[in-house]
């Protein structure tokens, strides 16, 4: 008897996550059943289901499967965090490359090679043809998207709309193109699920056909999601265990990637003295730790045994006994000669000067001539040349070309935090330039703090839902959860985009990250029809010294009565004095038994001057910063409020005009709180929703 | 009044498998997170995990995932912690502590001596 | 890991006195730092969260200061009550972790 084949590798699954339809119209199907692997075998053969499955659901708790024609990409769907949930999706649905020939590719790609719009499969216009949907059932030829029904030499192609064109292939790369990787590849976190030769890969949360002990949930950090190739064991290159049992593992072809492509785990910039960022490319020889302990050497196992070898980290440097950051860590480190301390920190090396000696700009850099073309966080400026279509979008004067000259650092825009340049980087189109305002400079980027010149409202009214405005309604207000629990507190500003503090993100991997919109309690608890869990697929920190973040959702937030965003308020605008406003948050409260109920604090806005005096001369304000004190004695943004907003009405409308980050002590009596003035870094903020990639509804 | 009550002093041989509690009273029992922390006779403390009661979400610390396991019950408001195999360097006082958010770990349990010895 | 360096391991100090413990992180915890105060065979108790904000019903001779690094509690005029070790902690970042404790005895 044939064994059936074990189709759940072809699911990339998201733990602890759903779906839910808003669609009433899609359709689902379930069934009780022991295992996700009898729902993935069932979904690929489409077996007594009356759709073509895309994705499916196990529910361990009632060991149930939901079959779904629809994936987390369609429309009328939405993701949710549910701890009895994991979800998966066929990786032929949600691919955007081909494997081989392309037979299996489903993608949504309809346009072809030269550009020409694919005519649909179901239609006869403008070409005759024998390939119908019905004709060619589980081979997906769906609307007009490219396919390869036969599996013919030259990948997936479709019939055109131009009657001139019978067909034409699709230009859609290669799996293998697309991937790619840097050194060997122990940061790899792609998409590659075949080996060179051509052998799926075994899921690593599975022990069949090849036991073994690369358990996702032991080894949490090093990506092992689904059956992708990775390198967690310093081997010269990604691999996997294969699901041919004679064969246990294989090397995977992922090619290396070319100069020019950057990813968050290429080293920047290489120093010896200094650190820049996080200290990924510093070749110095300092050998001991911030306490004085001394380095091991990296090519020893005593006194501590471990993998960070110079064998294993082929790109890292990993010399001597010198503090390296092979791993991404916060700072170079290095393992220690002390048996008793494993690890320690190189805190001593300091951070590389960010005015590059005599190097500086006066106001706000518009003037800059300097020639340093490289962005704070090391990547090398593009052309301005190459950039002037995307300029003038978010320009509405034509820039001084001569200024424009190379790839320097400038400032075309006005932009009020200093010289920048586009990067060439997708991920980064463009960022500030590491360059300070030149000492003694004390020309003002807004005028007039004081006095209310412009006014922070838009002159448009408060969205109102039948009928009624909605004043009490507080659906911007975001929950960050690191590793599921309350972190902090963030504004939507926009569908795709959440507004934060830096400190709100004590770790680098973003999987670790969710953000829970729509919900009054803090753990959900009755919060169930209205949350919206999104996870985040990039952070955007601000100008130097803002302490703010945009983060990215991974996908738009669906705007519905639950999640609403909020306003940002006029670039440089003043709240006059006394104005009521107010702080959100499910931070501390001081109350011995908190319910996790979303808690309010009101607030009223106080002069940069008189709130100075409040903080007895200690705090000197400036124009990024905006100040509130307490109507009640002892209220106020505490730990879990930070990163949430200080909200003000004005003409009926509301505006974040704060963000709370922490500062000096929780709710002190008669210490008004100090909040990253919005207004100060608005215009950053549009260019950022301007100018960033953001996923498509 | 708050308080957190744990289970009685326990003495174990290697090998053996154990469970201890923690009751909460006077407060949301599935607002706040209950956190384990070991003292070693001497010593220091040592975070090993925490469990959000309503959901039963776990994160531990590297160095005690795999020995312990840590859970609760919502129903009767009672968080634990088990070994289903105890080793001699398990013999430490046990401490559960709520925190609902940052550092705030504001009661403590009065603590469960754990003593494991052949 | 991050480490948490306290120091002095132990000190002597009569009452009345002022006494100062510092504990260093190894890296940024931004000021998600707390001091705890233990008694032979009690559990320790929370004297101060969020590095400065001291808990309900503690005493106003404790204090805390510091962020990002480097953190400080500082006791204004000993009291016999308030010889004990004490401990800071880190709860920024998973796992969290403690410093290795100060104990504070009689002169």
């Known amino acids: 008897q044939r064994k059936r084949r074990n189709t759940i590798h072809e699911f990339k699954k998201s733990a602890k996550t759903t779906l839910i339809k808003i669609d009433p119209a899609l359709k689902i199907k379930t069934k009780k059943v022991n295992t996700a692997d009898q729902c993935a075998n069932r979904c690929t053969r489409n077996k007594g289901l009356p759709f073509t499955c895309k994705a499916f659901v196990f529910d361990k708790a009632r060991k149930q499967c939901l079959w779904f024609p629809f994936n987390s990409m369609s429309s009328g769907v939405k993701k949710e965090f549910g701890h009895e949930f994991d979800l998966y999706e066929n990786k032929d649905y949600i691919r955007n490359c081909i494997i081989g020939k392309g037979r299996s590719y489903k993608g949504t790609v309809s346009i072809t090679k030269s550009g020409i719009k694919c005519q649909p499969w179901s239609s006869m216009i403008p070409h005759e043809h024998s390939f119908l949907p019905s004709s060619y059932r589980g081979k997906d030829l769906q609307e007009n998207y490219c396919r390869n029904p036969r599996g013919e030499e030259g990948g997936p192609w479709c019939f055109t709309s131009n009657p001139e064109v019978r067909y034409e292939v699709c230009d859609i790369p290669q799996c293998s193109e697309v991937e790619c990787m840097t050194c060997n590849g122990e940061s790899y976190r792609g998409l590659m699920d075949h080996t060179e030769s051509g052998k799926i890969c075994q899921r690593w949360d599975h022990q069949t056909p090849h036991r073994h002990k690369f358990l996702p949930e032991r080894y949490p950090d090093k990506g092992f999601d689904d059956n992708y190739c990775r390198n967690p064991d310093g081997q010269p290159r990604p691999w996997c265990y294969t699901l041919d049992p004679h064969t246990r593992w294989e090397y995977c072809a992922i090619k290396t990637c070319a100069d020019n492509t950057m990813n968050d785990t290429d080293v920047p910039l290489e120093t010896t003295e200094c650190i820049q960022g996080q200290g990924e490319g510093y070749r110095g020889t300092v050998n001991t730790i911030w306490n004085g302990i001394p380095c091991q050497r990296w090519d020893s196992q005593y006194p501590h045994e471990h993998d960070m070898t110079p064998e294993n980290f082929k790109c890292k440097d990993l010399r001597e006994n010198y503090c390296r950051n092979p791993d991404g860590s916060e700072s170079p480190w290095c393992f220690t000669t002390d048996p008793n301390i494993r690890v320690g920190y190189c805190s001593q090396i300091p951070n590389c000067d960010m005015s590059h000696g005599q190097d500086c700009y006066r106001g706000n850099g518009k003037n800059y001539m300097g020639n340093l073309s490289q962005t704070r966080s090391g990547l090398t400026c593009s052309m301005w040349d190459k950039n002037m279509e995307d300029l003038h979008r978010h320009i509405f004067w034509e820039p001084d070309a001569s200024k424009l000259n190379e790839n320097y650092c400038r400032n075309p825009d006005d932009d009020a935090h200093g010289p920048w340049c586009y990067t060439g980087n997708p991920l980064i189109p463009w960022d500030y330039c590491p360059i300070s305002r030149c000492e003694g400079d004390t020309t003002p980027t807004i005028v007039n703090l004081d006095h209310p010149v412009i006014s922070c409202a838009k002159t448009k009214q408060l969205r109102v839902v039948n009928g009624i405005p909605t004043r009490t309604n507080i659906g911007w207000m975001v929950s960050l959860r690191y590793r599921n629990k309350h972190i902090c507190g963030g504004s939507l500003i926009k569908e795709s985009w959440v507004l934060t503090a830096r400190q709100c993100f004590p770790s680098r991997d973003l999987k670790d990250y969710e953000a829970w919109l729509g919900i009054h309690d803090v753990h959900g608890r009755g919060d169930e029809k209205c949350k919206q869990v999104l996870n985040v697929s990039q952070l955007v920190y601000g100008p130097e010294g803002s302490d703010l973040v945009l983060m990215k959702l991974a996908r738009p937030a669906v705007l519905d009565d639950f999640v609403s965003t909020i306003d940002l308020p006029n670039y440089g605008c003043t709240i006059p004095e006394k104005t009521s406003c107010s702080v959100y948050g499910w931070g501390y409260t001081g109350l011995i038994n908190y319910d996790g109920l979303l808690r309010v604090a009101h607030l009223y806005i106080m002069g940069n001057e008189k709130c100075s005096q409040h903080h007895r001369g200690k705090v000197t304000l400036n124009e990024s910063e905006i100040c509130a004190g307490a109507e009640k004695i002892g209220s106020g943004p505490c730990e879990g409020d930070y990163g949430g907003p200080l909200v003000c009405e004005q003409h009926k409308m509301r505006m974040v005009l704060g963000v709370i980050v922490p500062g000096r002590g929780c709710a002190i009596p008669n210490r008004p709180g100090i909040f990253v003035r919005v207004a100060y870094y608005a215009k950053w903020i549009h260019k950022i929703i301007l100018t960033y990639k953001v996923p498509q509804s | 009044e708050v308080q957190l009550v744990q289970s009685g002093a326990e003495v174990k041989k290697p090998g053996e498998s154990l469970r201890i509690s923690c009751k909460g009273s006077?407060?949301?029992?599935?607002?706040?997170?209950m956190h384990w922390v070991r003292q070693m006779p001497g010593k220091g403390l040592e975070w090993m995990g925490e469990?959000?009661?309503?959901?039963?979400?776990?994160n531990y610390n590297p160095s005690f995932q795999g020995h312990v396991t840590i859970s609760a019950d919502k129903s009767i408001s009672t968080a634990y912690l088990q070994w289903s195999s105890l080793k001699a360097s398990d013999t430490a006082m046990y401490y559960c502590?709520?925190?609902?958010?940052?550092?705030?770990?504001?009661?403590w349990g009065q603590g469960t001596l754990v003593t494991v010895s052949s | 890991d991050i480490q948490m360096t306290q120091s002095p391991s132990s000190l002597s100090a009569s009452v009345g006195d002022r006494v100062t413990i510092t504990c260093k992180a190894s890296?940024?915890?931004?000021?998600?730092v707390s001091w705890y105060q233990q008694k032979p065979g009690k559990a320790p108790k929370l004297l101060i969260y969020?590095?400065?904000n001291r808990n309900t019903g503690v005493p106003s001779r404790f204090s805390g200061s510091g962020s990002g690094t480097d953190f400080t509690l500082t006791i204004s005029s000993l009291q016999p009550e308030d010889f004990a070790t004490y401990y800071c902690?880190?709860?920024?970042?998973?796992?969290?972790?403690f410093g290795q404790g100060t104990k504070l005895e009689i002169k």
């Open positions: 006077g407060y949301s029992f599935t607002t706040y997170w």
């Open positions: 469990i959000n009661p309503t959901n039963g979400h776990t």
């Open positions: 890296e940024n915890v931004v000021s998600y």
């Open positions: 902690g880190q709860s920024y970042n998973y796992p969290y972790t």
């Open positions: 502590a709520r925190n609902y958010v940052g550092s705030i770990f504001d009661y």
């Open positions: 969020g590095a400065s």
